[in-house]
């Protein structure tokens, strides 16, 4: 599964949080940023998470208008030059300082569960998904035959009204 | 080629009930959101409902919500729109739609042509 | 919900003319929008995603942009084959399209 074009067809500043309406926030601790998922107190600032979209050409047979077989892939940045990161050897998910071109692991497909409800699968790991593992996130293997819709990989996207990022 | 093909419209009695399909070929079905929507006489596009790829969600349009209601089989890449309880104000060409991306609920990629709905005594 | 209103609801213009249709959304969509040609007797036909991306065999004389409640709709210069209603459409909240402009030649 390729990415079609090197630019973004856009982007999104939102603030991530789970479908528990726990929210997805990022801390810089000994020179390195660490992922927690936890419940604000009221009127607290939620972080902010900069959601590059890029189409995709799934791999396929099927003929078609040139729409079929595309995705849409995600990159996510809460701060400037670092990026989520798939470890799928460690079933983690991390935040790395990267240079464009961004390493497969940084890619993400988004899933629509919910009309305004998102998952993250892999780009790397068909199948494993962004999701929340004792209040850390977490890669999460989905059988194919569940429902998708299994609420520890649901996010929701806030709108924020900054247009600034970092 | 891309091909979608909506039956099962015509005149109906308001109260009445009637079911739409929606045969998909060229694409892999079970991949894409797919969506009605419905044009009055003369007026514009009104979104309807939508289902999510494994069907597992549904949504509608407030004015149809109880009365109509949106399913997919994957297997036969169908998917159904079966209206109950109609009224007048459901007269108009209703289309079927599919996402523009795999997974995604964003932009109706591809339509058909439609099949016209009458609701009238 | 969300309220989607474009102007003008007809627009006359002449072969060459650089036109532009505008669509106003009642909160901020985050550029979720669609634009959609339809010619008289056909379907709807998906002309611009995002806002701003051209589908797939769409001309270049077709554009998009906007940011926030604002968009617009160009075409550089119009073309007979132009001749349709155009209705944009967002996906930031649920689905609402708005209620189209009829483009017209003079």
């Known amino acids: 599964m390729s990415i079609t074009g090197i630019s973004p067809i856009t982007e999104y500043l939102a603030s991530l949080s789970t479908y528990n309406d726990q929210s997805i926030t990022f801390a810089l601790e000994d020179e390195s940023y660490e992922i927690y998922v936890e419940d604000l107190k009221k009127d607290e600032k939620k972080d902010k998470v900069l959601l590059s979209y890029y189409e995709s050409q799934h791999p396929s047979n099927e003929s078609g208008d040139g729409v079929d077989g595309k995705m849409l892939m995600v990159t996510l940045s809460p701060t400037k030059d670092f990026w989520l990161h798939a470890n799928n050897k460690e079933h983690s998910v991390e935040l790395h300082k990267s240079e464009k071109p961004l390493p497969d692991q940084a890619f993400f497909v988004l899933h629509n569960m919910h009309s305004n409800s998102v998952s993250f699968e892999s780009k790397t790991d068909p199948g494993v998904f962004i999701g929340v593992k004792d209040n850390h996130l977490a890669l999460i293997k989905v059988d194919s035959s569940e429902n998708l819709s299994t609420e520890n990989i649901l996010f929701k996207l806030s709108e924020t009204h900054h247009h600034h990022h970092h | 080629e891309v091909q979608l093909v909506e039956t099962g419209g015509g005149l109906v009695q308001p109260g009445r009930s009637l079911k739409l399909s929606c045969v998909a070929s060229?694409?892999?079905?079970?991949?894409?959101?797919m969506y009605w929507i419905r044009q009055a006489p003369g007026m514009g596009l009104e979104w309807v409902s939508s289902?999510?790829?494994?069907?597992?969600?549904?949504y509608y349009l407030d004015s149809v919500k109880g009365r109509f209601t949106i399913s997919r089989n994957n297997a036969e890449n169908t998917v159904y729109l079966q209206m109950n309880s109609l009224r007048s104000e459901d007269t108009a060409t209703y289309y079927c739609?599919?996402?523009?991306?795999?997974?995604?609920?964003?932009?109706?990629?591809?339509w058909g042509q439609g099949t016209l709905v009458t609701v009238s005594s | 919900d969300i309220q989607m209103t474009q102007s003008p609801s007809v627009l006359s213009a002449s072969v060459g003319d650089r036109v532009t249709l505008s669509c106003k959304a009642s909160?901020?969509?985050?550029?979720?929008l669609d634009w959609y040609q339809q010619k008289v007797g056909e379907a709807p036909k998906l002309l611009i995603y995002?806002?701003?991306n051209l589908q797939t065999g769409i001309p270049s004389r077709f554009s998009g942009s906007g940011s926030g409640t604002d968009y617009t709709l160009t075409i550089s210069s119009l073309q007979p084959e132009d001749v349709a209603t155009y209705f944009c459409?967002?996906?930031?909240?649920?689905?609402?399209f708005g209620q189209g402009t009829k483009v017209e030649i003079k």
């Open positions: 995002f806002t701003n």
């Open positions: 909160h901020n969509i985050n550029k979720h």
């Open positions: 289902i999510n790829n494994d069907g597992g969600n549904t």
């Open positions: 739609a599919k996402g523009h991306y795999y997974y995604s609920s964003y932009s109706l990629g591809y």
């Open positions: 060229g694409f892999t079905f079970s991949n894409y959101w």
């Open positions: 459409f967002q996906y930031n909240s649920g689905w609402t």
